[in-house]
Amino acid sequence: GSVPPMVNVTRSEASEGNITVTCRASSFYPRNITLTWRQDGVSLSHDTQQWGDVLPDGNGTYQTWVATRICQGEEQRFTCYMEHSGNHSTHPVPSGNSHHHHHHHH
């Protein structure tokens, strides 16, 4: 059977006026997954995103990540979109510098 990913979005200062937002998916099976940043619901172009490899996490499941740089103050326009085994979810950028809670999706 399939194991849905836990999705976690974090933010960090990149440079003056910019922040890097990172979306991590972990503990999912099988390994096929779509993870992408969207602006106003539209996927960002590939050249503005950085992806990590889909790697085993040691529990028979997998993990991966995608990151992009955005302008501070525009966070509300951006979401991380995840699709896995026929299910999907959308994840906002957290406010401030705090980590976003993990969300398990079924």
Epitope: R38, Q39, D40, G41, V42, S43, L44, S45, T48, Q76, R77, T79, Y81, E83, H88, S89, T90, H91, P92
Partner: antibody, heavy 118, light 108 residues
Framework: EIQLVQSGAEVKKPGSSVKVSCKPS????????IYWVRQAPGQGLEWIGY????????IYNQQFKDRATLTVDKSTSTAYMELSSLRSEDTAVYYC???????????WGQGTLVTVSS | EIVLTQSPATLSLSPGERATLSCSAS???????LHWYQQKPGQSPRLLIY???NLASGVPARFSGSGSGTDYTLTISSLEPEDFAVYYC?????????FGQGTKVEIK
């Protein structure tokens, strides 16, 4: 086949409100944003706002922020746009549209004509 | 707000002729955020070209798009009778999302 079906034409009095519905089909309702756009007779296209049906986030064009209300009913996979304090210049065709993978508006509803007249 | 100015407002041409439509932005925008739509009388707009130069599904190859920065162009290499319509450019780079005022391509 992806379709967005909107409610029928409305005639409203100045000062009243109108609520237009949009029911998409052919894809997972919560996977794409729903945008609203209007077009006055013989005029161009004007973006009102959008809603992310999955998380409920709404982004408005500031010009409509005080009068437009966007909502979704996930149980019926339907999106709504309500416009209050109607005036004659709100007479227009109101469209819903779906955000696309690579563009803001990839599929459109058939439009709903709202006529504001005393 | 980014203002998109389309020119000309009306283009009168005959079938078989080449149509060149311009869209000028008040501020520079990434080519990833410039799209074109076609609208025929009594119909909803239809996505024609996305991200400056990519044809939407089902759009004939006689349509093409180009441009960068503040200047973008939609070209119809040889007009067919069904191409006579209004064309809108639209930017998604900054809020509010905006459209040009449209160029009407009419039969001469």
């Amino acid at each position: 086949e992806i379709q967005l079906v909107q409610s029928g034409a409305e005639v409203k009095k100045p000062g009243s409100s109108v609520k237009v519905s949009c029911k998409p089909s052919g894809y997972a309702f919560t996977s794409n944003n729903i945008y609203w756009v209007r077009q006055a007779p013989g005029q161009g296209l004007e973006w009102i706002g959008y809603i992310d049906p999955y998380i409920g986030r709404i982004i408005y064009n500031q010009q409509f922020k005080d009068r437009a209300t966007l909502t979704v009913d996930k149980s019926t996979s339907t999106a709504y746009m309500e416009l209050s304090s109607l005036r004659s210049e709100d007479t227009a065709v109101y469209y819903c549209s779906r955000s696309g993978e690579r563009s803001n508006f990839d599929y459109w509803g058939q439009g709903t004509l709202v006529t504001v007249s005393s | 707000e980014i203002v998109l100015t389309q020119s000309p407002a009306t283009l009168s041409l005959s079938p078989g002729e080449r149509a060149t439509l311009s869209c000028s932005a008040s501020s520079s925008i990434s080519s990833n955020y410039l799209h074109w739509y076609q609208q025929k009388p009594g119909q909803s707009p239809r996505l024609l070209i996305y991200r400056t130069s990519n044809l939407a599904s089902g759009v004939p190859a006689r349509f093409s798009g180009s441009g960068s920065g503040t200047d973008y162009t939609l070209t119809i290499s040889s007009l067919e009778p069904e191409d006579f319509a209004v064309y809108y450019c639209q930017q998604g780079g900054s809020l509010p999302l905006t459209f040009g005022q449209g160029t009407k391509v009419e039969i001469k």
